[in-house]
Interface confidence: low
């Protein structure tokens, strides 16, 4: 019992959560509270928005991102992707790993013009030590944070 | 081997289902099915709508609401909120972990006002033993419950 | 330490990805690749579509489908439904596990004809050594398939 | 019923600014965004940008990036539109105009500004 | 130049149809509004959407598209609706609205 406890606290696991700073507009990936709240580290390492793995092996990843807007904003794409990539030593381009399409824009009403969608991914993905997961959100100004509850990011080994 | 397994099996995990019961109506959580069909508990008990923890840890925590309805009626906000949220002894309110709010209305179309959407919500947080989570929607009258298979909330020890 | 890392090592999981032949059109369920790119099987086996249980226990079990359109096709259903189903040798019909019914069609827009949209299912089931998972989508006409990564299959015990 | 109620005609000077309010009278412009339209004298409508007052977003087109900046404010129900660096090509006739958005429809239209360039 | 190419000048014979076009690639993703505008008065929307009418728009008028083309349809035109008839849409990147040059249109009789 001991051995499975053990087994149970050294299995590695995070969730990171949206903040304030997570849009950057730079064109890069989401970045994301790590320590506060409900975010937490185990096991795995974080580095400018990237979840960086020490242990390799097949890891469970996830991520959901809240979406907002009035109508379909002039300057954005109709179509929004959310997805998480992987960045490999091995190769000078990110992979995509698990991506969704979505036109969130449609879910205005004629009577409201004021919109919600959330887009959530998770799959079973194998990852090497050293390898990084990053969120990418296109276009990242329909992403609504608030508090970590309605956009985050995370995984755990399987 | 026999370690391996073991430690399968004492895995907490739980799969809760939706049934005609689920809504109340009075403003609580929705109440779930335990046992019949596909529903189960092992290593986490139930209390009131609540998964109820027995074994401190991290548990990645889900849940999915079906959502349906004919236009957007009035009297119902535009905006759907489906969450799950922790109650603690340690702190009077319950505590948002994960949120997502849509704006399902939108979906129906100009031939056919009749809409279905779907929210789903997973990730993993840090649960200690006595601590409980709940799902909520607001509101609740847009939930559409059949067999069990379209609205269902769970957990399984990461 | 040995005997955790076995542990993980022989935990049952797969992760299988959309492919050109994934639709058949032919009624039944959604094929999948099994073996290139992100997909692989571990301590599971696959057949016409289906996750074949060679470990009976507590699985967690997954899908996406990438779901896409222009405006809502005549003799199309306005309404989609995505489902992850068990054959059982002890029963002679498919039994219904996780779906979700969404009406995408009403994410075009008045200003675009062009939608896209995406259903994840996940959660727990228990599942006996022979028994099998397949995932459905009526009508699978909308399934928009690219490269493995925006509609998948998957599963692992927990 | 909701207007939209515009400020007064201006002369300018060429290199001056110009800014333009909008005000929804009987209403706010909460669930809407509103865009800005201007019309040459003799010439067609074209669309300057627009703003979504509720998420203070703004947006412009290309022609104008840089030369124009839309604001909003909530509390007023009023929105603004400024152009810098006028010319005399700037001669025109400016409408706020209720977008309802996902429509790209304007709805409702402000009676115009007329703003006059000229040294 | 416009995205959005219309006729210039149209006429119509009092109580028949005329149909205006407006072409773009853009309309291929997108549909396309409608607009009328009299002499000194602002532009009045008259066709959104598929085919929506704000309230107060006679159901003379309709709207329809097919490819890369939008067309306002007049049944049964009548005197008051001689004005100016503008379209718009996205452009082709879908980040910003374009309109068409506009169609004089003359009611004749």
């Known amino acids: 019992l001991i051995q499975e406890r053990r087994s149970h606290e050294v299995n590695p696991a995070a969730h990171l959560t949206g903040a304030n700073s997570s849009l950057t507009g730079s064109g890069g990936p989401l970045l994301w509270e790590t320590q506060l709240g409900l975010a937490f580290l185990r096991g795995l390492s974080y580095h400018d928005g990237a979840l960086v793995v020490t242990k390799a092996g097949y890891y469970y990843i996830y991520s959901k991102v809240q979406l907002g807007g009035v109508g379909c904003p002039l300057g954005l794409a109709s179509t929004i992707t959310h997805g998480l990539y992987k960045r490999t030593p091995r190769y000078p381009e990110e992979l995509e790993l698990l991506v969704s399409q979505q036109s969130p824009c449609g879910r205005a009403t004629s009577s409201s013009r004021v919109w919600w969608d959330s887009s959530f991914l998770g799959g079973v993905v194998h990852l090497e030590a050293g390898e990084e997961v990053v969120v990418r959100v296109l276009d990242e100004r329909l992403v609504r944070l608030r508090d970590g509850t309605r956009s985050y990011f995370g995984a755990f080994m399987v | 081997l026999i370690q391996e397994r073991r430690s399968h099996e004492v895995n907490p995990a739980a799969h809760l289902t939706g049934a005609n019961s689920s809504l109340t109506g009075s403003g609580g959580p929705l109440l779930w099915e335990t046992q019949l069909g596909l529903a189960f508990l092992r290593g986490l008990s139930y209390h009131d709508g609540a998964l109820v923890v027995t074994k401190a840890g991290y548990y990645y925590i889900y849940s999915k609401v079906q959502l349906g309805g004919v236009g957007c009626p009035l009297g119902l906000a535009s905006t759907i909120t489906h969450g799950l949220y922790k109650r603690t002894p340690r702190y009077p309110e319950e505590l948002e972990l994960l949120v997502s709010q849509q704006s399902p209305c939108g979906r129906a179309t100009s031939s056919s006002r009749v809409w279905w959407d779907s929210s789903f919500l997973g990730g993993v947080v840090h649960l200690e033993a006595g601590e409980e989570v709940v799902v909520r929607v607001l509101d609740e009258r847009l939930v559409r419950l059949r067999d069990g298979t379209r609205s269902y909330f769970g957990a399984f020890m990461v | 330490l040995i005997q955790e890392r076995r542990s993980h090592e022989v935990n049952p999981a797969a992760h299988l990805t959309g492919a050109n032949s994934s639709l058949t059109g032919s009624g039944g369920p959604l094929l999948w690749e099994t073996q290139l790119g992100l997909a692989f099987l571990r301590g599971l086996s696959y057949h016409d579509g289906a996750l074949v249980v060679t470990k009976a226990g507590y699985y967690y079990i997954y899908s996406k489908v990438q779901l896409g359109g222009v405006g809502c096709p005549l003799g199309l259903a306005s309404t989609i439904t995505h489902g992850l189903y068990k054959r059982t040798p002890r029963y002679p019909e498919e039994l219904e596990l996780l779906v979700s019914q969404q009406s995408p069609c009403g994410r075009a827009t008045s200003s675009s004809r062009v939608w896209w949209d995406s259903s994840f299912l996940g959660g727990v089931v228990h599942l006996e050594a022979g028994e099998e998972v397949v995932v459905r989508v009526l009508d699978e006409r909308l399934v928009r398939l690219r490269d493995g990564t925006r509609s998948y299959f998957g599963a692992f015990m927990v | 019923e909701v207007q939209l109620v515009q400020s007064g005609a201006e002369v300018k000077k060429p290199g001056s600014s110009v800014k333009v309010s909008c005000k929804a009278s009987?209403?706010?412009?909460?669930?809407?965004?509103v865009s800005w339209v201007r019309q040459a004298p003799g010439q067609g409508l074209e669309w300057l940008g627009g703003?979504?007052?509720?998420?203070?977003?703004?947006y412009y087109a290309q022609k104008f990036q840089g030369r124009v900046t839309i604001t909003a404010d909530e509390s007023t129900g009023t929105a603004y539109m400024e152009l810098s660096g006028l010319r005399s090509e700037d001669t025109a006739v400016y409408y706020c105009?209720?977008?309802?958005?996902?429509?790209?429809?304007?709805?409702?239209w402000g009676r115009g500004t007329m703003v006059t360039v000229s040294s | 130049s416009s995205e959005l190419t219309q006729d210039p000048a149209v006429s119509v014979a009092l109580g028949q149809t005329v149909r205006i076009t407006c072409q773009g690639d853009?309309?291929?993703?997108?549909?396309a509004s409608w607009y009328q505008q009299k002499p000194g008065q602002a532009p009045v929307l008259v066709i959104y959407?598929?085919?929506n009418r704000p309230s107060g728009i006679p159901d003379r008028f309709s709207g329809s598209s097919s490819g890369n083309t939008a067309s306002l349809t007049i049944t049964g035109a009548q005197a008051e609706d001689e004005a100016d008839y503008y379209c718009?849409?996205?452009?082709?990147?879908?980040?910003?609205?374009?309109f068409g040059g506009g169609t004089k249109l003359t009611v004749l009789g």
């Open positions: 105009a209720r977008d309802q958005g996902f429509e790209d429809a304007f709805d409702l």
């Open positions: 009987g209403g706010t412009f909460s669930n809407y965004a």
């Open positions: 703003i979504l007052p509720i998420f203070d977003t703004s």
């Open positions: 853009s309309l291929r993703s997108y549909y």
């Open positions: 959407g598929k085919n």
């Open positions: 718009n849409s996205r452009d082709s990147s879908g980040n910003h609205v374009v």
